[in-house]
Each structure stands twice: as structure tokens, then as C-alpha cells.
Interface confidence: medium
């Protein structure tokens, strides 16, 4: 059917959510003075969506047993940043920390957690809390992986050929098709760590009516649909 501006809106547009928060913190009930008997060091891989808020937690040690808390932050291409708090003198110290979005959640004598408000693509890296206590040192590390939702488009660029693009996602999205066609997929890597995936498919079978591009990504999946129009050179675009 005739389409204004030759364009088709195919599915709901990219979701707009209020800034979400995520945390791997334990609650007070899980805090134990016998933590040393359980685990001395924990490292967690943590995928977090860009533009959300994240809270990173120290080991569940009661603050009264604390001597020093140190957050060590290693981001790609930057010198190591440390944020330290010494309980005895109630003083905090920062070294090489320039990103104002990474802060203590509140006063470190009340809460040792670190917050990132909001998470940016540059916050990919390793975050480690080191708690010095009379019973020894306890660590909790986070390999923070910032996830970026790709912008997805689908259009027909030639007779019975469709192109599906997942632009600037992190990590790279995966693209599959229903029904399967004769497909070629390319990846383009950007300096900020995002990846654009482009899949071009051709369907020789003439009874294929609509094709579905299914984009799988850690931030969520999307399916787009387009009708194969028998018009050489016709370009129907559909941006999510």
C-alpha cells in the first residue's frame, strides 16, 4: 500500500524508562561478623545498562569492625582511581578520581557502598572494595560491563532483499531471521566500544510474504517485520 515518505513503523519504539537502579548489595540481615569464615574475596561480573544508576557494595562487614575502606577503580585508558576512608580519623582521600558521577552513596562512616549516577559507556572497568579489619583484609571486586541498547532498523533495499541493522550496541547484538534466507552479516566496531551489526538477506522463494528480523541483545530482544515488496530498488525503512 502507498506509504507516506516510503516509511513503515514496524514495532514499538525504543523504550523510555525512568532511570532505573541496580545493585548487588546484601541487606543488613546478611551481614555477618563471621564473614572471614565464609569468603575472603569475591569477584563478580556485572552487566549494567547505560544511563541507569548502579550501586556497588563492599563485603558485608559490620562497620564497627572497620579500620580502612578503599575503593579501587580501574577504567580503560585512565590511571587507577582510589577513594579511601579511614575510620579512626574519619577522613576520606581520593587519588586520580575525576569522574563526578562515581561517588560514595552517603558518608562512608555510615555506608561504604559506591554509586554511579548515571552509568556511562566510559564506566566499563574493574571496581574493587578493600576492607581492612582487625581480622584481616576483605575484598569484593566487580567487572562492570556497561550495556548499550542498539538502535534497530529494518528496510528492503532491493527486490526480495532486506537489511536489518543493530546500530551501536554493546556488546554486539545477534541477528536471526524468520524464515532463513541467503544472508551475509558484517560487524563494524566503534572507538567507544560499541558495535554495529548489519545483516543482509535475500529470499529467492517467491511465496515468502513477510520476513522477521530478530535481534537478540543482553538488554532485551526485539523483533521487526517487513513485507517483501516485488519492486526493484524500492526502499522501505523502519526505524525503532
Amino acid at each position: 500500500a502507498a506509504q507516506p515518505n516510503n516509511s513503515l513503523m514496524l514495532q514499538t519504539s525504543k523504550e523510555n524508562h525512568a532511570l532505573a537502579s541496580s545493585s548487588l548489595c546484601m541487606d543488613e540481615k546478611q551481614i555477618t561478623q563471621n564473614y572471614s569464615k565464609v569468603l575472603a574475596e569475591v569477584n563478580t561480573s556485572w552487566p549494567v545498562k547505560m544511563a541507569t544508576n548502579a550501586v556497588l557494595c563492599c563485603p558485608p562487614i559490620a562497620l564497627r569492625n572497620l579500620i580502612i575502606i578503599t575503593w579501587e577503580i580501574i577504567l580503560r585508558g585512565q590511571p587507577s582511581c582510589t577513594k579511601a576512608y579511614r575510620k579512626e580519623t574519619n577522613e576520606t582521600k581520593e587519588t586520580n578520581c575525576t569522574d563526578e558521577r562515581i561517588t560514595w552513596v552517603s558518608r562512608p562512616d555510615q555506608n561504604s557502598d559506591l554509586q554511579i549516577r548515571p552509568v556511562a559507556i566510559t564506566h566499563d572497568g574493574y571496581y574493587r572494595c578493600i576492607m581492612v579489619t582487625p581480622d584481616g583484609n576483605f575484598h569484593r571486586g566487580y567487572h562492570l560491563q556497561v550495556l548499550v541498547t542498539p538502535e534497530v532498523t529494518l528496510f528492503q533495499n532491493r527486490n526480495r532483499t532486506a537489511v536489518c541493522k543493530a546500530v551501536a550496541g554493546k556488546p554486539a547484538a545477534q541477528i536471526s531471521w524468520i524464515p532463513e534466507g541467503d544472508c551475509a552479516t558484517k560487524q563494524e566496531y566503534w572507538s567507544n566500544g560499541t558495535v554495529t551489526v548489519k545483516s543482509t538477506c535475500h529470499w529467492e522463494v517467491h511465496n515468502v510474504s513477510t520476513v522477521t528480523c530478530h535481534v537478540s541483545h543482553l538488554t532485551g530482544n526485539k523483533s521487526l517485520y517487513i513485507e517483501l515488496l516485488p519492486v526493484p530498488g524500492a526502499k522501505k525503512s523502519a526505524k525503532l
Partner: antibody
Framework: EVQLQQSGAEFVRPGASVRLSCTTS????????IHWVKQRPEQGLEWIGR????????KYAPKFQDKATITADTSSNTAYLQLNSLTSEDTAVYYC???????????????WGQGTSVTVSS | DVQMIQSPSSLSASLGDKVTMTCQAS????LNWFQQKPGKAPKLLIY???NLEDGVPPRFSGSGYGTDFTLTISSLEDEDMATYFC?????????FGGGTKLEIK
Amino acid sequence: EVQLQQSGAEFVRPGASVRLSCTTSGFYIKDDYIHWVKQRPEQGLEWIGRIDPANGNTKYAPKFQDKATITADTSSNTAYLQLNSLTSEDTAVYYCTRQLGLRRTWYAMDYWGQGTSVTVSS
Amino acid sequence: DVQMIQSPSSLSASLGDKVTMTCQASHTINLNWFQQKPGKAPKLLIYGTSNLEDGVPPRFSGSGYGTDFTLTISSLEDEDMATYFCLQHTYLPWTFGGGTKLEIK
């Protein structure tokens, strides 16, 4: 408000032809596709075919290729289904429905006519 | 043509029950679900396998991928008594399943 208004019930003799109409309002017929669907008494749904009213292009299910002809008149926002060489097998309710071209349900049959009953009997 | 097998062909359930029905295709497809009440035209419930059409109660949900699809009603209500059809729109000719007739016990 989007509506598809179909013509009234038809009683026809075997071998005759009939033309059913589907007049739309609330949208421009030329922007969308119109499909026709057959439902025999107490049976399932069968896709007959569709038309792109903007250019008259049609697609038919093979079993209806020689039975049905779909046309459209954009000036009156009306689509038609002509059925020829009628037999008792053609006794059914026939629905028109649109395939929306302009938003997320473009490929779905989101609005339907009320149906036209066709009875073929001698 | 793509064959669409719906099962069961009929089912009886009580109010408040969770109800599921399936549609199996002979090819990988995308599909829509419709509800039809006696003497009425079909009504679109779900498009693109899992997307709820505007105005459809959230107790309805669709799932599946490829060739196997499910329509679920999380808590059956009186007004859900109807016949449910699936439709594939990936290949021409478009084809419907044979329907699942849902009755209230």
C-alpha cells in the same frame, strides 16, 4: 473511528456469481491492504486473498485463484469480492479485514467487517 | 502451503484457571492470535507472536519461536469463552489454524 461495513446477505443459485462489497471509513483505503477471509458454517477461517488498493495489485490463495476476484475503488473507499461459478461449497460467511500499513500492526488484521453471509442453494 | 496445527481442538476450563493452547507450524513463521465469539467477526489479540494488541486484557499472552507457539490466558474469565485461531503471515498464502474452542465448565 475505523469501520468496515459489508453488504447484506446473499441467496444465490448454483452456477451464478455474486459481488460483495466492503466500504471503509476512518482511514484511507489506498494506504492499506484489504484482505478477504472465508468461514464456512461451524468451520475455521480461510484466507482468500488481498488487494493493494493503491495500485490494484492482488494476491490469492491458490484454491481461490479461479473462484475469487478482488477489486477496489479508492474514490468510494470500497473493496469488492466477486465469487463466480458458485456451488454449495461456497456457502459461507465472507469477511473483509484490513492489513494496516502505517503503524506497528501493519501486518495484522486489526479491524474486520461484520461479515456477509452467502447461501448457495437451488 | 504452511500447515498450522492447533491443539487442542476444544477444551473446557473453570473460571480462574490458567489455560494454554498451542499452534504448530510446518515452517518457521511469525504469527498472530485471534479470538472469535459466536456470530461475530474475529478480533486480533496478539500480533508478532507475543505483542498484545491495544485494548486486550493483560491476562492474554503469547509466546514461542520458529514453529511452536502458545497462547496463554492466566486467569480465565466468563468473557473468554470463544474460539481462538492462529494465523501465519510469513508465507503466501496466509494460513489459519483450525481453531481451539474454549468452553467454561
